[in-house]
Amino acid sequence: ECVTQLLKDTCFEGGDITTVFTPSAKYCQVVCTYHPRCLLFTFTAESPSEDPTRWFTCVLKDSVTETLPRVNRTAAISGYSFKQCSHQISACNKDIYVDLDMKGINYNSSVAKSAQECQERCTDDVHCHFFTYATRQFPSLEHRNICLLKHTQTGTPTRITKLDKVVSGFSLKSCALSNLACIRDIFPNTVFADSNIDSVMAPDAFVCGRICTHHPGCLFFTFFSQEWPKESQRNLCLLKTSESGLPSTRIKKSKALSGFSLQSCRHSIPVFCHSSFYHDTDFLGEELDIVAAKSHEACQKLCTNAVRCQFFTYTPAQASCNEGKGKCYLKLSSNGSPTKILHGRGGISGYTLRLCKMDNECTTKIKPRIVGGTASVRGEWPWQVTLHTTSPTQRHLCGGSIIGNQWILTAAHCFYGVESPKILRVYSGILNQSEIKEDTSFFGVQEIIIHDQYKMAESGYDIALLKLETTVNYTDSQRPICLPSKGDRNVIYTDCWVTGWGYRKLRDKIQNTLQKAKIPLVTNEECQKRYRGHKITHKMICAGYREGGKDACKGDSGGPLSCKHNEVWHLVGITSWGEGCAQRERPGVYTNVVEYVDWILEKTQAV
């Protein structure tokens, strides 16, 4: 069961896996959650009754029964991992710790104006896990305003000590705030021969890349496929690093694949969730249980529901045996990966889906869409909402996109003349406007946040957030869309769609059924040529056919320009303005969302 509260002055006895140092019990709980085996933890706070060398220790623990005996101990704080919980989990930690020095390898020292600047530097440095900043009140003159970037093998400090007039904190890479490039390519027939920090077994290069992404020291990887000539190295995933942060040595070698950590894109692609099944593949590991199951899907469910299960192998039933049920082997290992992978034995293997909640909800695959046609089908664009005003009468005002369980992203120009959020209603999971009746449930709007530099759509900053009064429960028909990663600025999107209930021609009416149109992106240079009287800035993005004919129109404003990249949908643009609708050589102009990711995160993550 899920226990979120912390137990003060309580220590769990036994079950120790490893000890790390964390600046708070709250962060110790996060570290425990992300550790492959940790189910419980005991943290020691600073206290006069405790030996200072034990302050800030976070002891990660495991137990077959999922609990351990409790002992009273002053300054000890204990709790359970969030593995047992169903809610979204994030490693993002924006806290700044005053008068704490988090020890690690100090590999970079520079002057910074503030702790915030130091944290930004850490976030944009490929090696940095955390930092310590000496404030201007620091006693030693030559160390004042010094920003020390640090890293360790585990990503957590090697020790934490009290030190006056310094502050420490963590990199915000896991908050999607890094400007580092996001390189998603996997390079076939390539070995990176740089330093190995670890090696694990993986069924394919994608899983290897995802393991690299959530390993604190891994910057890139090499994977040896099951056709690799050296049998003892098949399915081996080498996690690698280098001083420069890039591979220094690329060697052509058939049956090997290499790629990069997706740390800078982890908010828009799954990195923890290995959802595929591997046929004719057996995963070896410590056996947790053997259960009868009807199918490999049922076996995966059993593994997901067993909190200690990390992966499984299902052996289908022999004909007419055991009521058609096969054997489901639930397994675990010290690092969450199989200890060996064997092929040709007829098993079907896979991983627990428990870790999927550590990924952003927006990365969940949605059902296949209908190709062709202009009318959408239910669940095709589950992030699309219809924003209604109730004054003077109720009507569709604008589109919008779900980007979080309490947040809608839309256009600022939608709120011209809107005096209060009280007159707004957000309807999600809607296909036809005619579904909206008096008793249709909606989300009230608590707050409208308009970009403070917004004046008019044509001059940019046409972006607004709606904070909902209640949270959205994600389902197949209402779920969030991913924001583009800042590291993805150079991605060329080729599969982009605009959706909305807006007019189908300039003089028309709001459509009943949600419409969709596939529209190619247009370069800003090309777009500027089409709008000589306007300034097309880098904060805008354009889309449209040269010959016209397909475009967003009145009523689509605020809705999404959704682009699919690597199987995940991204909110690339917000429908903003254009000259007429679908006119020849007049592309639609959209707010370029990637340029506002910091603004969005600042507003939505504000405490």
Epitope: V191, F192, A193, D194, S195, N196, I197, S199, T222, P229, K230, S232, Q233, L236, L238, K240, T249, I251, K252, K253, S254
Partner: nanobody, 126 residues
Framework: QVQLQESGGGSVQAGGSLRLSCTAS????????MAWYRQAPGNECELVST???????YYADSVKGRFTISQDNAKNTMYLQMNNLKPEDTAVYYC????????????????????WGQGTQVTVSS
């Protein structure tokens, strides 16, 4: 038990030459990727040169044009011909089999299926 044994190290003046050999026992070169690594005091282990099972070769930029890797499958031996040696080439040289990169910057720890020799010292004086 797989064993790799290096030989041919020694002291030499800058501009001089040395030829390192690596002989394998309980192990055949035919289907293996062989390499020379080196580690200077206080430095990380670095890849010097590789010869892959399909005959492809790789050289670190610092040794290109001066070092040549080769192997004699019949003798189960790999060689590194080092010409025009420089003081910065001073290091312990390690022979490795199926070892793509060092572990934690150290020329001794391997992952499954990878092997290291004991190393041979090369000292180049100016």
């Amino acid at each position: 038990q797989v064993q790799l044994q290096e030989s041919g190290g020694g002291s030499v003046q800058a501009g001089g030459s040395l030829r390192l050999s690596c002989t394998a026992s309980e192990f055949t070169f035919d289907d293996s990727d062989m390499a020379w690594y080196r580690q200077a005091p206080g430095n990380e282990c670095e890849l010097v040169s590789t010869i892959t099972s399909d005959g492809g070769t790789y050289y670190a930029d610092s040794v290109k044009g001066r070092f040549t890797i080769s192997q004699d499958n019949a003798k189960n031996t790999m060689y590194l011909q080092m010409n025009n040696l420089k003081p910065e080439d001073t290091a312990v040289y390690y022979c490795a089999a199926d070892q793509w990169g060092s572990a934690e910057g150290d020329c001794t720890s391997s992952y499954p299926g990878g092997y290291w020799g004991q190393g041979t010292q090369v000292t180049v004086s100016s």
